[in-house]
């Protein structure tokens, strides 16, 4: 806590400007008006303050807004955001996507911090659902964001938001998450034609049931092995050799290299040897 001292004569800051880097901590506390700071927060980011000086500025804002900062201040926090604790952020009501972007930009290139996680949580809860624009923004900054959500949280994602999801955004999703996302993707892309539909749905197929895989096998989709290996084992097991052959097309030869790995291994064990032999790959059931 910085002790309360009177501002020396001639040192009262008329504005937030570049001269403040030469103020000692106690001078900042005594000579910078908190209300002035709040209205000129946009200037703070351009001034090379020390971490200790930023602590003083934060303290002044905390005193001015004990119930939490208004969005007009939050939007211009800049590097001061890095000084905020999750407890501070829980007091905020952030509704503007521009504010969210501005704060994510400050943390860009770093792992998702507890502060950022809290900010996103507050923002999404405030919006009521994970809409397309929000998802677009979050996955642009954190490609793994979607897969960091629980299946329960993912259930609030409207199908329309699925259009914002890129294949790399699903790289770290587990089957439980894909189980939630797949039906939404199916709904979102339902009006697309066969080949375009497959391109879009491919990343979500780890949550597809058997009947959908059977349907895809009738459409000459030529699924690659990487996608096939991510399918749910329980969805792959009921597929016939002919259906898998149609599903994979020219990629069927890749089964040989994966014969010891799930779901290929389990699927092979469920097939008649005669049927497997029709593939000519030397697969042993």
């Amino acid at each position: 806590e910085v002790e309360k001292t009177a501002c020396p004569s001639g040192k009262k800051a008329p504005e937030i400007d570049e001269s403040l880097i030469f103020y000692k901590k106690w001078e900042l506390e005594a000579c910078v008006d908190a209300a002035l700071l709040a209205t000129q927060m946009d200037r703070v980011n351009a001034i090379p303050f020390t971490y200790e000086q930023l602590d003083v500025l934060k303290h002044k804002l905390d005193e001015l807004y004990p119930q939490g900062y208004p969005e007009s201040v939050i939007q211009h926090l800049g590097y001061l955001f890095l000084k905020m604790s999750p407890e501070d952020i829980r007091k905020w009501n952030v509704t503007s996507l521009e504010t969210l972007k501005a704060l994510l930009e400050v943390n860009k290139g770093h792992e998702m911090s507890p502060q950022v996680a809290t900010l996103i949580d507050r923002f999404v809860k405030g919006r009521g659902q994970l809409d397309k624009d929000t998802l677009d923004t979050l996955t642009a900054f954190y490609p793994g964001y979607l897969c960091s959500l629980s299946p329960e949280e993912l259930s609030s994602v409207p199908p329309s938001s699925i259009w914002a999801v890129r294949p790399q955004d699903l790289d770290t999703c587990d089957p439980r998450q894909l189980d939630v996302l797949y039906p939404k993707a199916r709904l979102a892309f339902q009006n697309m034609n066969g080949s375009e539909y497959f391109v879009k749905i491919q990343s979500f197929l780890g949550g597809a049931p058997t009947e959908d895989l059977k349907a895809l096998s009738q459409q000459n989709v030529s699924m690659d092995l990487a996608t096939f290996m991510k399918l749910r084992t329980d969805a792959v097991l009921p597929l016939t050799v002919a259906e898998v052959q149609k599903l994979l097309g020219p990629h069927v030869e890749g089964l040989k290299a994966e014969e010891r790995h799930r779901p290929v291994r389990d699927w092979i064990l469920r097939q008649r040897q005669d049927d497997l032999d029709t593939l000519g790959l030397g697969l042993q059931g």
């Epitope: 008329p14 504005e15 937030i16 400007d17 880097i21 030469f22 090379p48 020390t50 971490y51």
Partner: antibody
């Protein structure tokens, strides 16, 4: 382009005060600070003071009591006032732009200076 | 106030030679924000000073690469790799880490 131009009286009587104006163009005083520097004949540079973008000032410790810097952003002018001049205040007075953004407080552009002689 | 001490006061050189000017400060010029606000200026005869190097080692626009700055803390050096006629004049170091800002006393670069 960036320009700074000082205008002063040239000659000042001892014990009188000096007023110099620095008129700038090519940039705004609300975005850049201005320093005043003087140079006695054949000597080195002496920093007098600075006026920051917000209007705050800092001064040379030894001359603080005699100096006052102010500005008029709308007219793009900065003013230096120095009281109680003596003959050893004879010098060339420069105004210079402090670039705190890209150049981190260095003085990147200087005026041509105005010569001030203190003599009766 | 921070005192800036420059050596030598005068530096006679032959054209094409390397020149080295030293600047020492009475206290560290590392600001609490991590930056070191040490700058070099050149004043040619009859002209205003001009910025050469800012923040220890960054050349200002238009400054030839034969000029280089180095140093840290309290000890700094300006080097001119091959002196040319247009380099003659008085070189000043200056600090803007602490207010009041201060200049060194100057080093006159002249022909031997």
């Amino acid at each position: 382009q960036v320009q700074l131009k000082e205008s002063g009286p040239g000659l000042v009587a001892p014990s009188q005060s000096l007023s110099i104006t620095c008129t700038v163009s090519g940039f705004s005083l609300s975005s850049y600070a201005i320093s005043w520097v003087r140079q006695p004949p054949g000597k080195g540079l002496e920093w007098l003071g600075v006026i920051w973008t917000g209007g705050g000032t800092n001064y040379n410790s030894a001359l603080k009591s005699r100096l006052s810097i102010s500005k008029d952003n709308s007219k793009s002018q900065v003013f230096l006032k120095m009281n109680s001049l003596q003959t050893d205040d004879t010098a060339r007075f420069y105004c210079a732009r402090n670039n705190y953004g890209r150049l981190d407080y260095a003085m990147d552009y200087w005026g041509q200076g105005t010569s001030v002689t203190v003599s009766s | 106030d921070v005192v800036m001490t420059q050596t030598p006061l005068s530096l006679p050189v032959s054209l094409g030679d390397q020149a080295s000017i030293s600047c020492r400060s009475s206290q560290s010029l590392v600001h609490g924000n991590g930056n070191t606000y040490l700058h070099w200026y050149l004043q040619k005869p009859g002209q205003s000073p001009k910025l050469l190097i800012y923040k220890v080692s960054n050349r200002f626009s238009g400054v030839p690469d034969r000029f280089s700055g180095s140093g840290s803390g309290t000890d700094f050096t300006l080097k001119i790799s091959r002196v040319e006629t247009e380099d003659l004049g008085v070189y000043f170091c200056s600090q803007s880490t602490h207010v009041p800002f201060t200049f060194g006393s100057g080093t006159k670069l002249e022909i031997k």
